[in-house]
């Protein structure tokens, strides 16, 4: 049951982000997962590293992966998917999952290639009146239904405010998204929900929009969170450069 000879799925994540690496196998039998092993093969002559193993309802992260890896799949339903949090540069490489069924010699193997990019800026700058895109993407090899995307704002006034909410009720197939409060009609979802992308665009930025924006993407009982700090600077004076004097001329409100 070797999936290693087909080209493995690839994930590209930024340092500090999370990655969900799928390891699901289809079985005609009613047997449950007995043991799971996750190994990292960094390549370039580096030694393989053990990431996590599971047996007898005991999930054990190893070494530097402690507190950063969890089995996220439904083990009873042939899913040994691994969630890697707070991704580091050293985490780059090929992750190999091995699943064993009780009383079977066959081993189901699956690989995922993880590429790690430098950390994305956690702080963004925008001028009053401008527009800004705030990214929030959860990288996963598995197509999982996003059930909710939520953006929460906390500014200097300490009170938390809902910026944007998206729901997807699977049973009723109802999609519902809305921007709230003083963000009403100024926020749009620009990410592709079906690719676990909950990025938003904020337009008509006000000075009071400066603060922390926390995005949470819900995939069933799995929640991915990311916080962005937005700094708002006063409106940029629009300048006109005259070829003769090369001197800036500040335009008034009704001048063109």
């Amino acid at each position: 049951l070797n999936d290693l000879n087909v080209s493995p799925p690839e994930l590209t994540v930024h340092v500090g982000d999370s990655a969900l690496m799928g390891c699901v196998f289809q079985s005609t039998e009613d047997k449950c997962i007995f043991k799971i092993d996750w190994t990292l093969s960094p390549g370039e002559h580096a030694k393989d590293e053990y990431v996590l193993y599971y047996y007898s309802n005991l999930s054990v992260p190893i070494g530097r992966f402690q507190n950063r890896v969890h089995l996220m799949g439904d083990i009873l339903c042939n899913d040994g998917s691994l969630l890697l949090q707070d991704v580091q540069e050293a985490d780059q490489g090929t992750y190999i999952c091995e699943i064993r069924l009780k009383g079977e010699s066959q081993v189901f193997k699956k690989a995922v290639v993880l590429h790690v990019l430098p950390e994305e800026p956690k702080e963004l700058m925008v001028h009053v009146g401008g527009l800004i895109q705030m990214g929030c993407v959860f990288q996963s090899t598995e197509v999982k239904h996003v059930t909710k995307v939520e953006w929460i704002f906390s500014g200097r006034r300490a009170k938390e405010e809902i910026v944007f909410r998206y729901y997807h009720k699977l049973r009723m197939s109802v999609e519902y998204s809305q921007s709230w409060g003083h963000f009403q009609n100024r926020v749009n979802l620009v990410g592709d929900i079906f690719r676990n992308d909950g990025s938003i665009m904020l337009q008509g930025v006000r000075e009071s929009d400066g603060g922390n924006y926390t995005c949470s993407i819900h995939l069933g009982n799995l929640v991915f969170k990311k916080t962005i700090v937005l700094h708002v600077s006063p409106e940029e004076p629009r300048t006109l450069v005259t070829p003769a004097a090369l001197r800036p001329l500040v335009l008034g409100g009704n001048q063109l």
Epitope: D37, D48, L58, G63, Q66
Partner: antibody, heavy 115, light 104 residues
């Protein structure tokens, strides 16, 4: 040198409890499973259970559930086994042993305490 | 259940010794052999049925598959006098063979 240093012999009354300790030296305590094994002339070596100090997870041999309780203190790199409701049947040698992971679902006891 | 045989045996220096271990079901090479000298704790000799642990003399070897496994000592030495145990790590509860007492 990697070592497991166990507490000494104990003299206890029937019905009482006792807590045995096992201090890990010269390795990262949270990286390895710690197991406890009982040895008697009649039953030979019997596996009691495992604690993984990193995750705090435990698995017990059904036979010792209710008899043994395994705990671990990360700060002192020490594993403990508490035995309750003691009888003469419990009077024997107990080993703590470190289980090393060899990959691909293979694990073996590579370091043992003196008992 | 692991059935180990023989329960005891005596061998001369230079002789080849074989100890066997039979599992009640397939344990897929998840077997180890330990040596325990009088008054000491067990020591790992062989893991994964046939891999020699670091520092163990090459006269020790392991073989087998499925339910049948064996430990071979190629040329018995006086320091090999001990009790030998097999152990299966395929599933919990982990179990040990009853042991084989090897005497000179």
């Amino acid at each position: 040198d990697v070592q497991l240093v166990e507490s000494g012999a104990e003299l206890v009354r029937p019905g009482a409890s006792v807590k045995l300790s096992c201090k890990a030296l010269a390795y990262t305590f949270t990286d390895y499973e710690m197991h406890w094994v009982k040895q008697t002339p009649v039953h030979g070596l019997e596996w009691i259970g495992i604690i993984h100090p990193g995750s705090g997870g435990t698995v017990y041999n059904q036979k010792f559930k209710g008899k043994a309780t395994l705990t671990a203190d990360k700060s002192s790199s020490t594993a403990y086994m508490e035995l309750s409701s003691l009888t003469s049947e419990d009077s024997t040698v107990y080993y703590c042993t470190r289980r090393r992971y060899y990959g691909s679902s293979y694990w073996y006891f590579d370091v043992w305490g003196a008992g | 259940v692991l059935t180990q045989s023989p329960a005891s045996l005596a061998a001369s220096v230079g002789e080849t010794v074989t100890i066997t271990c039979r599992a009640s079901e397939n344990i897929y090479y998840s077997l180890a052999w330990y040596q325990q000298k009088q008054g000491k704790s067990p020591q790992l000799l062989i893991y994964n049925a046939n891999s020699l642990e670091d520092g163990v003399p090459s006269r020790f070897s392991g073989s087998g598959s499925g339910t049948q496994y064996s430990l071979k000592i190629n040329s018995m030495q006086p320091e090999d006098t001990a009790t030998y145990f097999c152990e299966q790590t395929y599933d919990v509860p982990l179990t040990f063979g009853a042991g084989t007492k090897l005497e000179l």
